[in-house]
């Protein structure tokens, strides 16, 4: 996160760290807890690393440097990448992770509410992006979970900023015209959440951007509302019943 500040314990209890353990262990992506056994993240996090057993998912964590060999983590039972995601295209950058064992909810580890299907009418004015990603383009993973308040921008505005790309309906963009605040490398897959009527909802999944926090280059996020049917279908067919945290 560029231009952000330290988060507090329990402030973003749905935020998880997706880490890969090969020879060493490192944080690669963020994710959002959306049910006892489900994490929503970006499909591109698994490019070249589709093997379930190399991944470790840490929830209820604020400081990555607190993680030791004794810190409990979740393992992956199943990775469900959106069927239309292609490595050569930025579209449909969404994936579900089914955990091997359900997580208990605590003050520091609980799910984020999902938006209503095809939610286009809600005007979100209080949106935040969180993650342990770089604090500048040529930076490094941060220890303490960072947060930054960023306004949504229209898809028309976003398309103007990215004339050489296709900003699809299933994407949402956020950023300041002057830059300075944005997600960055290592924040991918993490949440863009907005508070509306006193409730936090998962509006976007950190996907891509041109560099980080550049002027007139907003961050691009996967628009979760456009994938509600897919999320429900995949979680129900796997579970027999939905265990999602939907808005009341």
């Amino acid at each position: 996160i560029v231009g952000g500040t330290n988060s507090s314990w329990g402030e973003w209890p749905w935020q998880v760290s997706l880490q890969v353990k090969l020879t060493a262990q490192r944080h690669l992506c963020g994710g959002s807890l959306i049910g006892h056994q489900w994490v929503l993240t970006a499909a591109h996090c698994f490019d070249g690393l589709p093997l379930q057993d190399v991944w470790r998912i840490y929830s209820g964590i604020l400081n990555l440097s607190d993680i030791t060999k004794d810190t409990p983590f979740s393992q992956i039972k199943e990775i469900i990448i959106h069927q239309n995601y292609k490595v050569s295209e930025g579209n449909h950058d969404i994936a579900l992770i089914k955990l091997q064992a359900p997580l208990n909810y605590t003050e520091f580890q609980k799910p984020i509410c999902l938006p209503s299907k095809g939610d286009t009418s809600t005007i979100y004015t209080n949106c935040w992006v969180t993650g342990w990603g770089f604090s500048k383009e040529k930076g490094e993973i941060q220890n303490i979970l960072q947060k930054v308040n960023i306004p949504l921008v229209t898809n028309e505005e976003c398309q103007k900023a990215y004339a050489d790309a296709k900003i699809a309906q299933a994407m949402v963009c956020a950023g300041y015209k002057e830059g300075g605040k944005d997600a960055c490398k290592g924040d991918s897959g993490g949440p863009l959440v907005c508070k509306h009527n006193g409730m936090w909802r998962l509006v976007g999944i950190t996907s891509w951007g041109e560099g980080c926090a550049r002027r007139e280059q907003p961050g691009v996020y996967t628009k979760v509302a456009e994938y509600m049917d897919w999320i429900l279908e995949k979680t129900q067919s796997s579970d027999g019943k939905a265990q999602m945290q939907s808005p009341a």
Epitope: A42, H44, D47, K86, V87, S88, E89, G90, N91, D93, G133, Q159, A163, D164, A165, K166, A168, A183, C184, K185, G186, D187, S188, T206, S207, W208, G209, E210, G211, C212
Partner: antibody, heavy 125, light 108 residues
Framework: EVQLLESGGGLVQPGGSLRLSCAAS????????MTWVRQAPGKGLEWVSY????????IYADSVKGRFTISRDNSKNTLYLQMNSLRAEDTAVYYC??????????????????WGQGTLVTVSS | EIVLTQSPGTLSLSPGERATLSCRTS???????LAWYQQKPGQAPRLLIY???SRATGIPDRFSGSGSGTDFTLTISRLEPEDFAVYYC?????????FGQGTKVEIK
């Protein structure tokens, strides 16, 4: 399966015009940036031009600027290259290519993911 | 414009040997925008590596890419008969997009 099929090449006199076409299939054409690359006989590859998915944004190499025009018809899944004021040095095999723009570490990648078989343009009197 | 310089111009090796091809850029290139292509006589180029180090779909793991900044490398760990071809590096970090002049890998 992604397929790109160029056509329209041939022999043309210096100062003449030619319009190349590239018919695309097997992918969502309107989502992809498209490009033309050429290769003079026995030489290396030279990028010519690209066009954004919507067709609203185009960029050209200095060597063809003002003479060549790239365009696309997303309803026909076809890419075009209108070549005017042709010169002997424009003689080459012209390839159209689909530009992959994936995501890696929250940044985009960009590369020529699929290529057509090429069409030969010969400019000679 | 960003100039890409490939070396050597020609590499004469035997099947089974290791090939190391270099690509130097005149300015910094974000590695996400550096690709390698293979071209055989009479054929269109084929994508091998994108993002400096990611193998394209269907490319055997004997091909690997590495490097960052201004210095990039394509390595073929054990040359197979079908690997003898011309290899190009290419950047799309900044327009005009540019290619290296190519390295020909020929049978010794």
């Amino acid at each position: 399966e992604v397929q790109l099929l160029e056509s329209g090449g041939g022999l043309v006199q210096p100062g003449g015009s030619l319009r190349l076409s590239c018919a695309a299939s097997g992918f969502t054409f309107s989502h992809y940036l498209m490009t033309w690359v050429r290769q003079a006989p026995g030489k290396g590859l030279e990028w010519v031009s690209y066009i954004s998915p919507s067709g609203g944004h185009t960029i050209y190499a200095d060597s063809v600027k003002g003479r060549f025009t790239i365009s696309r018809d997303n309803s026909k899944n076809t890419l075009y290259l209108q070549m005017n004021s042709l010169r002997a040095e424009d003689t080459a095999v012209y390839y159209c290519a689909m530009v992959g723009q994936g995501i890696r570490g929250r940044s985009r990648t960009s590369y020529f993911a699929q290529w057509g078989q090429g069409t030969l343009v010969t400019v000679s009197s | 414009e960003i100039v890409l310089t490939q070396s050597p111009g020609t590499l004469s090796l035997s099947p089974g040997e290791r090939a190391t091809l270099s690509c130097r850029t005149s300015q910094f290139v974000n590695s996400n925008y550096l690709a390698w292509y293979q071209q055989k006589p009479g054929q269109a180029p084929r994508l091998l590596i994108y993002g400096a180090s990611s193998r394209a779909t269907g490319i055997p793991d004997r091909f690997s890419g590495s490097g960052s900044g201004t210095d990039f490398t394509l390595t073929i760990s054990r040359l197979e008969p079908e690997d003898f071809a011309v290899y190009y590096c290419q950047q799309s970090s900044r327009t005009p997009w540019t290619f290296g002049q190519g390295t020909k890998v020929e049978i010794k």
